[in-house]
Interface confidence: low
Amino acid sequence: KSPIFGPEEVNSVEGNSVSITCYYPPTSVNRHTRKYWCRQGARGGCITLISSEGYVSSKYAGRANLTNFPENGTFVVNIAQLSQDDSGRYKCGLGINSRGLSFDVSLEVSQGPGLLNDTKVYTVDLGRTVTINCPFKTENAQKRKSLYKQIGLYPVLVIDSSGYVNPNYTGRIRLDIQGTGQLLFSVVINQLRLSDAGQYLCQAGDDSNSNKKNADLQVLKPEPELVYEDLRGSVTFHCALGPEVANVAKFLCRQSSGENCDVVVNTLGKRAPAFEGRILLNPQDKDGSFSVVITGLRKEDAGRYLCGAHSDGQLQEGSPIQAWQLFVNEESTIPRSPTVVKGVAGSSVAVLCPYNRKESKSIKYWCLWEGAQNGRCPLLVDSEGWVKAQYEGRLSLLEEPGNGTFTVILNQLTSRDAGFYWCLTNGDTLWRTTVEIKIIEGEPNLKVPGNVTAVLGETLKVPCHFPCKFSSYEKYWCKWNNTGCQALPSQDEGPSKAFVNCDENSRLVSLTLNLVTRADEGWYWCGVKQGHFYGETAAVYVAVEERKAAGSRDVSLAKADAAPDEKVLDSGFREIENKAIQDPRLFAEEKAVADTRDQADGSRASVDSGSSEEQGGSSRHHHHHH
């Protein structure tokens, strides 16, 4: 599929001008290559009319130009003094005409309306309001006032001053007669439809002395604004319909076959399942304008979108609308990353978030999408040292691995953590990505004690048991704070006895705190990583209390002489597992999709990439009791 994008249809009137914008991926090659506008012939060729290399066909001499905007990835073709001969099929493209790096554009130039003398032209947008003014003379002041519409050869009564209203206009038309001082009556038509367009005749009086006035009503369907965004990226539709519909329900819909427009989201609480977790309808302003943000763009999101206002929250005849044509560029600069990450309850997940690598110094954020009302995304953590209070001790945003990716680790998972999360930065707004966290059944991997109490001035040793599947991973202990997790020295105590069917490759790694102080109180994590790519973590809260008796504390999972198959793992410890990144292959960004054959083995990763049919529940706030 060609990554070039432009308007599918351009309509204009004889004598007018058009401006046609074509979009291309702004790679360095594309920025400097030839741009062209050509007309398609009956036998398939395409004859160049104008190009960026200075060529202008004699047909376009003195009335057309082509301007490249390499920084935006666009070029614009302006054509003036249009005639009906200009109607036809064209291509805008890059390189050579036959190469296929192009987009088809249909240009239709119509004749200007043939108007009667003394005809007032009203040009109004679809869904809006028109006021047709009709002057009359004093002798007709007391006589019947009427408005007719010319249908074919015959005038059809639309409204009159005796109370008649044509059924096609019921509920959206009125006839106002001005005060005695002004010899004028007005007909106001609301919620204009395309079918309202045409020639009208105002009349005051019914005899040969009646006053008549011709009006031509042109109802404009909005030209779609072209929007060109990257696959996996984000788009924002800004919808400003005007203060007259400030209190009417708003919607964004996507046109499917024919005239159907399927609601994507509306202010009445409807949201299409395909957009769950990746859409926000930003609150309306007083003037009725609003915006809709969609993240995690997919190929199938491409198409024509309309925003509008109607009490039903969906497109109806006469809704005022705004239109966009969204093109999703598959030659995306946004790297693939898992769209679904699975973790076991009590476990952890490590989420990789892409960002624009040119903006390494930007602030990174992670927020939780909430579907209530029209969607919102309250922040949970940032790279500047802020963590939402309810997430203290179990959430960390790390700048690693860097170079276009940051990591978010969330541990102590519960079913309430299932839901959609957004990765954001304060830089390029197109790089908003979405990940769904799913909580699944399973056995935990890392084993740590429950919350631990240390004694002031004494030594505390906290164990972390790593199964053999992590034998090739780096094992670490760190102390959590709101800027990350600071690494601490730890001791490998040899094989662990905490696992059944696990050989000498299992490991018991201890954290030792000597001469405990009040400053040692807090959350500690043990975890695994490979280089700058993080895997599973487990968290322990260490409380510090006054000395009661001399000696050191050695916290173990259970009594040391327990047989491997004994059920000693009770409420005094926590088992934590992360199914998100366990297979070392997953640490390579480009290999985010584990082979499905790996899924049968519990030791393998469970990461989905691409769109997911399943939807997770929404998350709530989480509270710790320290």
């Epitope: 924002t236 926000l280 930003n282 609150p283 915006s291 943000v293 602030i363 954020y365 909430e370 919102r376 995304c377 309250p378 922040l379 940032d382 500047e384 802020w386 939402k388 209070a389 954001l424 930065t425 304060n426 830089g427 707004t429």
Partner: nanobody, 125 residues
């Protein structure tokens, strides 16, 4: 670069109301991507947080002493953020500053990227 300009300050009697407005402008401003906040600084005191509203208007936060009296709102179409102040007290006398943070606001912690010049509010008893 984002420029913030406050307006609406002035002299008001205790118990009265004022509405402050902050207009944001900038060459590449995507106003709906900024969290917005109001801070104030009384003579001889440190600048303190007043209220904030998040990037998509989903949440508002207020300093405890201003809850119920002050209301923050935003109009993304006009690139403005407003602060409605009711039941004003002499203690509310200060220079009020508008602040912006890309994507940001959460509780009373607000790491502003941009600041306005401030507008003086004086509450007389």
């Amino acid at each position: 670069q984002v420029q913030l300009v406050e307006s609406g300050g002035g002299l008001v009697q205790a118990g009265g109301s004022l509405r402050l407005s902050c207009a944001a402008s900038g060459r590449s401003l995507g106003f709906d991507t900024y969290g917005m906040a109001w801070f104030r600084q009384a003579p001889g005191k440190e600048r303190e947080f007043v209220a904030s509203i998040d990037w998509n208007g989903g949440s508002t936060y207020y300093a405890d002493s201003m809850k119920g009296r002050f209301t923050i709102s935003r109009d993304n179409a006009k690139n403005t953020v407003n602060l409605r102040m009711n039941s004003l007290k002499p203690d509310d006398t200060a220079v009020y500053y508008c602040a912006a943070a890309r994507y940001y606001t959460s509780s009373t912690y607000f790491p502003a990227n941009y600041w306005g010049q401030g507008t003086q509010v004086t509450v007389s008893s």
